[in-house]
């Protein structure tokens, strides 16, 4: 389980690096952050470490009430402060790993972080 979380953490952070450069990656991370009400890997300050992100900014999907530009010069109170790795990881353990008995290898670095069906399932529960 620790290995799964470690892989997921590394993968999530890797995708954060790609966020400003890759629209597909951005849309997946936006969906995850909005659906799971989280921001960044460990917390929202992780976005400060992404060199190509605009300064003083998190993705709008981090906002409690998502509006265009809400992540720029954000007010801390207006964004989700909890990190996504812990939040999504916990949900994965409970709803995906146990139910589907997914092996640790299935969450390897190049694999999708989480399937579209799983996201869809979470969104409606």
């Amino acid at each position: 389980r620790d290995k799964v979380m470690s892989e997921f953490n590394n993968n999530f952070r890797q995708q954060m690096e790609n966020y400003p450069k890759n629209n597909h990656t951005a849309s997946i991370l936006d969906r995850m952050q909005a659906d799971f009400k989280c921001c960044g890997a460990a917390n929202y300050t992780d976005w400060e470490k992404i060199p190509s992100m605009s300064k003083n900014r998190v993705p709008d999907s981090c906002c409690i009430n998502v509006t265009v530009g809400c992540g720029i010069n954000f007010n801390e109170k207006a964004i989700h402060k909890e990190g996504c790795v812990e939040k999504i990881g916990g949900w994965l353990r409970k709803n995906v790993l146990e139910q589907k008995l997914i092996s640790e290898e299935d969450l390897g670095g190049e694999q999708k972080l989480i399937s579209e069906e799983d996201l869809h399932h979470h969104h409606h529960h």
Epitope: N56, G69, N73, F74, N75, E76, K77
Partner: antibody, heavy 120, light 108 residues
């Protein structure tokens, strides 16, 4: 060095209007929320109004709502407070304050204040 | 609106003393509590934000603690320049931002 310089304070009669200004320097003005806080003679601090970096969010104390209007001009690095229908109880030293970057309501720098006296 | 109540309203202490000022919120404000110092004829100065974070340039003898409704500002060893009025302020439920009524710290 961060500097905030208020101006526009004066002696005015009740019911009249006044416009306060705050000139900012030493920081990227358009990244930060700004506030007005007042202090009546010998009294404590009272928050008057605040405005977000892009003017998208504004807030007012109940005591000034409908009478005072906060605004900013990021190009001029200036903050304003339009005060209408002034009352004797608005008499105070008015401070301009800068909010922290991601905690808008924490004032990390203050000007020296401008005195508004409302009296007939 | 959230009310902030400071105690005591005033206190006398000597240089070198350890001083504690308390602030109570009328409802939980998490850790969104800030402390300011104001000297006569001067503008307020931020000391502590988010209950316990020391503002840059503020001496380490100042510290803050608490969460929820009860907070304290502690000066570990009072210096002559610390005699001033101290205000707490909540930044949790805004607008409005609300301040405590102030605590005046005087020389004994």
């Amino acid at each position: 060095e961060v500097q905030l310089v208020e101006s526009g304070g004066a002696l005015v009669q009740p019911g009249r209007s006044l416009r306060l200004s705050c000139a900012a320097s030493g920081f990227t003005f358009d990244d930060y929320a700004m506030h007005w806080v007042r202090q009546a003679p010998g009294k404590g601090l009272e928050w008057v109004s605040g405005i977000s970096w892009n003017s998208g969010t504004m807030g007012y104390a109940d005591s000034v709502k409908g009478r005072f209007t906060i605004s900013r001009d990021n190009a001029k690095k200036s903050l304003y407070l339009q005060m209408n229908s002034l009352r004797a109880e608005d008499t105070a030293l008015y401070y301009c304050g800068k909010g922290l970057l991601h905690q808008w309501e924490v004032l990390d720098y203050w000007g020296q204040g401008t005195l508004v006296t409302v009296s007939s | 609106d959230i009310q902030m109540t400071q105690s005591p309203s005033s206190l006398s202490a000597s240089v070198g003393d350890r001083v504690t000022i308390t602030c109570r919120a009328s409802q939980s404000i998490s850790s969104y509590l800030n402390w300011y110092q104001q000297k006569p004829g001067k503008a307020p100065k931020l000391l502590i934000y988010a209950a316990s974070s020391l503002q840059s340039g503020v001496p380490s003898r100042f510290s803050g603690s608490g969460s929820g409704t009860d907070f304290t500002l502690t000066i570990s060893s009072l210096q002559p320049e610390d005699f001033a009025t101290y205000y707490c302020q909540q930044s949790y439920s805004t607008p409005p931002i609300t301040f405590g009524q102030g605590t005046r710290l005087e020389i004994k």
